[in-house]
Interface confidence: low
Amino acid sequence: EPHSLRYNLTVLSWDGSVQSGFLAEVHLDGQPFLRYDRQKCRAKPQGQWAEDVLGNKTWDRETRDLTGNGKDLRMTLAHIKDQKEGLHSLQEIRVCEIHEDNSTRSSQHFYYDGELFLSQNLETEEWTVPQSSRAQTLAMNVRNFLKEDAMKTKTHYHAMHADCLQELRRYLESSVVLRRTVPPMVNVTRSEASEGNITVTCRASSFYPRNITLTWRQDGVSLSHDTQQWGDVLPDGNGTYQTWVATRICQGEEQRFTCYMEHSGNHSTHPVPSGKVLVLQSHWQ
């Protein structure tokens, strides 16, 4: 799975007048990483793990970058012509990735009032616009503004692509946190489903990186996809991830089933606990 940096900025206008503030969130490897605090006008790390990524470095650079990006987006919103009465939003999502083979990907997406109207591959500079007439009009508006000075635009987008990757590399190089491997804690529980059946759930938590295989096996053979239910691999807020897989089995056959986990080259199997343990609720689901 590639390392990624994702910027999500939103600016607002009211009755055609662009508001002074902006909302900004940055995700690193899918984890909430930074948020722009509008009262303090600062980029703020999201939790201890985010602070650990940069160690004792200040967040001034991030603050400067987000402030500049917010200013650029406000200027872009000011050039959108169809702003009617009330509140409108312009959202920019920018993502860059570094893959295991060191190849890179960068893209940028614009949304107006939550609707995607313009995307750009920042490496090839190829633009994509949805078919709707509203999207076409908005895209033309924004592209015209961005192309007012062709040289500036070219520099701007090359710089955006380069800056995003540069920041991502800086985080990867400076951070032990992002190069670490944290093995998952695996926990198997059972709950009564219906008469004669039980639901067995295998949970993996607090692991890093994100890639994991978690599956139920019967007599050592993996069950088919359609007999298992998977949870998403989600950030747990501490820079690590959590997920689960569940299946329904016949009571009395528990010893035939194991949960198989594979993560960062290590693997383990986990049996179903014996006894009637009734799990009423779990914060994982």
Epitope: L23, S89, G114
Partner: antibody, heavy 117, light 107 residues
């Protein structure tokens, strides 16, 4: 210190009018959107109206649109709410509130409006 | 208008408990959400803005999370002064709307 102080609350008959005021101090009033929020006795918070920092644009809740008028005088650091055609359901404590831009960390102490025959 | 639905509507808990209140928006509101605390006869007090930023002077036992449509206010260890009514509010678009409130009572 930062302060908003409402005044003008009263007991009025249905169909009558009333004007509320909100005096601001301790911050740059002309830089902020200011809102009216109300709370009927024993009920939750209900947003009523907002006026932009420059006084040009205004926005209202559907329940008061066409009956209430929000205005401001930046030279006097004062916000107003002109309430016309009052109804029993307008009975509430009226707060003025502000913040960065529309999350309210500055609240007045509230003024009570009772509409009753 | 965007509707905000808070759950639960009321909640009984003890001092020291960890309490979670959720707020669901009828459509995506990014992180334009605030949380307020109100005690009987008092003015609402801002706790959290931008979904997770702690208002100045608010104890760190209060925290907010979420973005899009699902948001959470958490009090990590209830103190006697925390028993009150809590409201969420969206400021993503006008009309601004509040949740119906969650009343937190002593068990």
């Amino acid at each position: 210190q930062v302060q908003l102080v409402e005044s003008g609350g009263d007991v009025v008959q249905p169909g009558r009018s009333l004007r509320l005021s909100c005096a601001a101090s301790g911050f740059t009033f002309s830089n902020y959107n200011i809102h009216w929020v109300r709370q009927a006795p024993g009920k939750g918070l209900e947003w009523v109206a907002v006026i932009r920092y420059d006084g040009i644009n205004k926005y209202y809740a559907d329940s008061v649109k066409g009956r209430f008028i929000i205005s401001r005088d930046n030279s006097k650091n004062t916000l107003y709410l002109q309430m016309n055609s009052l109804r029993a359901e307008d009975t509430a404590v009226y707060y003025c509130a502000s913040g960065p831009p529309d999350a309210f960390n500055i609240w007045g102490q509230g003024t009570m409006v009772t509409v009753s025959s | 208008a965007i509707q905000l639905t808070q759950s639960p509507s009321s909640l009984s808990a003890s001092v020291g408990d960890r309490v979670t209140i959720t707020c669901r928006a009828s459509q995506g509101i990014s992180s334009a959400l605030a949380w307020y605390q109100q005690k009987p006869g008092k003015v609402p007090k801002s706790l959290i803005y931008d979904a997770s930023s702690l208002e100045s002077g608010v104890p760190s036992r209060f925290s907010g999370s979420g973005s899009g449509t699902d948001f959470t206010l958490t009090i990590s260890s209830l103190q006697p002064e925390d028993f009150a009514t809590y409201y969420c509010q969206q400021f993503n678009s006008y009309p601004i709307t509040f949740g119906q409130g969650t009343r937190l009572e002593i068990k």
